[in-house]
Amino acid sequence: SAPGEDEECGRVRDFVAKLANNTHQHVFDDLRGSVSLSWVGDSTGVILVLTTFHVPLVIMTFGQSKLYRSEDYGKNFKDITDLINNTFIRTEFGMAIGPENSGKVVLTAEVSGGSRGGRIFRSSDFAKNFVQTDLPFHPLTQMMYSPQNSDYLLALSTENGLWVSKNFGGKWEEIHKAVCLAKWGSDNTIFFTTYANGSCKADLGALELWRTSDLGKSFKTIGVKIYSFGLGGRFLFASVMADKDTTRRIHVSTDQGDTWSMAQLPSVGQEQFYSILAANDDMVFMHVDEPGDTGFGTIFTSDDRGIVYSKSLDRHLYTTTGGETDFTNVTSLRGVYITSVLSEDNSIQTMITFDQGGRWTHLRKPENSECDATAKNKNECSLHIHASYSISQKLNVPMAPLSEPNAVGIVIAHGSVGDAISVMVPDVYISDDGGYSWTKMLEGPHYYTILDSGGIIVAIEHSSRPINVIKFSTAEGQCWQTYTFTRDPIYFTGLASEPGARSMNISIWGFTESFLTSQWVSYTIDFKDILERNCEEKDYTIWLAHSTDPEDYEDGCILGYKEQFLRLRKSSVCQNGRDYVVTKQPSICLCSLEDFLCDFGYYRPENDSKCVEQPELKGHDLEFCLYGREEHLTTNGYRKIPGDKCQGGVNPVREVKDLKKKCTSNFLSPEKQNSKSN
């Protein structure tokens, strides 16, 4: 069974009075429609809340929105709708909040039918004041901030124009027409695709990929016959139509599109897709869809160039382009990812990797759980995690898995214990070691959030009935205490806490319903008085990540190094605090063959760690092309796994082979590239 609620934790005494003094109710003077909430800046305490209410009339829709602002983490709100002239804000564009702590906010307004362009409201002082700006175009997308300079904005118009502002939306300039997709790259570079023959859809596979590094003064065509493109880490990817047929292949560039190499990945047909699941500066996880409407594909992991790929996981669940995948980066522990596979019998199972896709295994069965009806053997089964796919299937799963980089090792997720994911009502499970071991944390579905870098976990039961109770744990979910935050239960709609899990405040959102009206209401609870003192050295203990066998000399080694962390003791009731920085100590490991992947033209036979040469590359779909032209490729058969820091130990040295191979792709040989200026 799950840990007891109000079990004698010996943790927080007299907490009811402490929490009652720190519980703040705010009733919004609104009819219930929809509500959206955004945090402005980091550690500023500023929250913007936009409520909208639609009344469909006979000929048109009447809409009303209200804007509220809090500067104390949601304890108090002020109606600031007058700052935006009581204008109706379009919720589909959300609130565009600037990067980092810029304090910038852009709201896109609804305008009447015949207007020349759209309208935005801009703030650069954390929403204290707004400036109304009429646009020379109707926006199709939310304003996109340059990650490097929050004064630079990008937007697409409904007429497929690419518009840029250099002064935070004050003035706009159309820098290109016929644009399908645009993205900011690094150093204020803009990448975008254009069509020539009428529309994005009609030209799919015949688009051009362009780049501007000076906000539209000059341009360079960096790709032709483009189907789509994407950015991940330091990699620029383009899927490119083949000359001969309707298949397409991935090409990759690490120099902003100046030179391209063909990725050693299978080509895909019209009905298939590629998807970048995750990317960093070292490598990329790429999903390649299987032919036919199977709902699954294969995950490949790249080398440091993004060119050579190793098969990582077969039968990876991914429903359709832009559809559902359960692929989740466990941010609380390096190298850990969780996803789902579709097994031969069409059941869905969860898999986990601890070494960045090198090996995948099932999740260990929680010690305090029994195998359910899906298990053939009642003593042997696994934990299966509910994520995006389960949510899309309308199972009783209110939240996806949760992890935070500053709450080391903690992963919280809904799941079931058996041979596959069950459609029965799930329970909530927690891991404190990044997914190696699991414990049932709460019975039944819950909303949950992490506060104070893991010092507090808060949960609310998912129920169709009104609720008035919140649960909290100061022991990483090992035991729970309950607090009644209001006498009058509310229909719960969501938990909100500041992104980054450093806050001690949690807001409970919902609505009250009476005979005639329903109103939005929020309760913000500050846990600061529960954790009365700041944590000291004695409150932390040392933990070795990825430890599986202390008798193994290289225990804890993942990607060539091990890391020890200072972690809060489960018995300590204290504040990590807003300035808490994870203390970790890395130590380098000796190299083994596991630290290398097989280079182009080599493969690993099953259950063997050595890379062997593919016999004359026969029968392998391995067209190889560097920089768009025929190249000499020299290799010793091994390549260090991206991000691997091992030293010494095994150093696989091979006779260097010359794998000179005809480059079969005519994509973007340098002479095809052209530049032009506005």
Epitope: R11, T541, I542, W543, L544, P550, Y553, R569, S571
Partner: antibody
């Protein structure tokens, strides 16, 4: 089989220091924390502190903070405990013990291997 | 630091008796508790870790239970070799031991 062998008995004058060694054999010394525990004649067990050889992370009981230094030498699989400003109350048997480990937590699973003990007598 | 209170401090029993020793923590330590046996002139020996897990090689007549603040060591049928002093030890704060329980022949 893992063994911890400690240095021999010591007789020390008040105000001086003592350094006791603890050499591990037959196991992966670097992957376990080593704790130091003392037992005064006829008294109970008292934890002084511990060290993790990888990274040399040491921590100490509040009572001994500033007076005890625990170190480890990975190359010789040896841990050391130095106690300074000795007084007569420090007369005790000093044990080193390996902290058992089933997970990444170094100190949570009890001390599964103990040294034979080193008697330290503080007398003027 | 977390205090550990062991009771009783001395216990007289006969071979074959069921013996129970309790240990109370000054605050919750979850299940992070170990039990040791020590005989005169010898180093302690680990019996139980994580409150209820039996260390390998330890006879099954020894068992541990409890979580939070209350813990128990039980010897189901006392054997001649079991007359010794027993210590509990918490591991979720800076390590502290209980005062010990001496099990002597009645």
């Amino acid at each position: 089989q893992v063994q911890l062998v400690q240095s021999g008995a010591e007789v020390k004058k008040p105000g001086s220091s003592v350094k006791v060694s603890c050499k591990a054999s037959g196991g992966t010394f670097r992957n376990y924390a080593i704790s130091w525990v003392r037992q005064a004649p006829g008294q109970g067990l008292e934890w002084m502190g511990g060290i993790i050889p990888i990274g040399g992370w040491a921590n100490y009981a509040q009572k001994f903070q500033g007076r005890v230094t625990i170190t480890a030498d990975e190359s010789t699989s040896t841990a050391y405990m130095e106690l300074s400003s000795l007084r007569s109350e420090d007369t005790a048997v000093y044990y080193c013990a390996r902290q058992g480990r089933k997970t990444g937590y170094y100190y949570y699973y009890g001390m599964d291997v103990w040294g034979q003990g080193t008697t330290v007598t503080v007398s003027s | 630091d977390i205090q550990m209170t062991q009771s009783p401090s001395t216990l007289s029993a006969s071979v074959g008796d069921r013996v129970t020793i309790t240990c109370r923590a000054s605050q919750s330590i979850s299940s992070w508790l170990a039990w040791y046996q020590q005989k005169p002139g010898k180093a302690p020996k680990l019996l139980i870790y994580k409150a209820s897990s039996l260390e390998s090689g330890v006879p099954s007549r020894f068992s541990g239970s409890g979580s939070g603040t209350e813990f128990t060591l039980t010897i189901s049928s006392l054997q001649p070799d079991d007359f010794a002093t027993y210590y509990c030890q918490q591991a979720d704060g800076h390590i502290t031991f209980g005062g010990g329980t001496k099990v002597e022949i009645k």
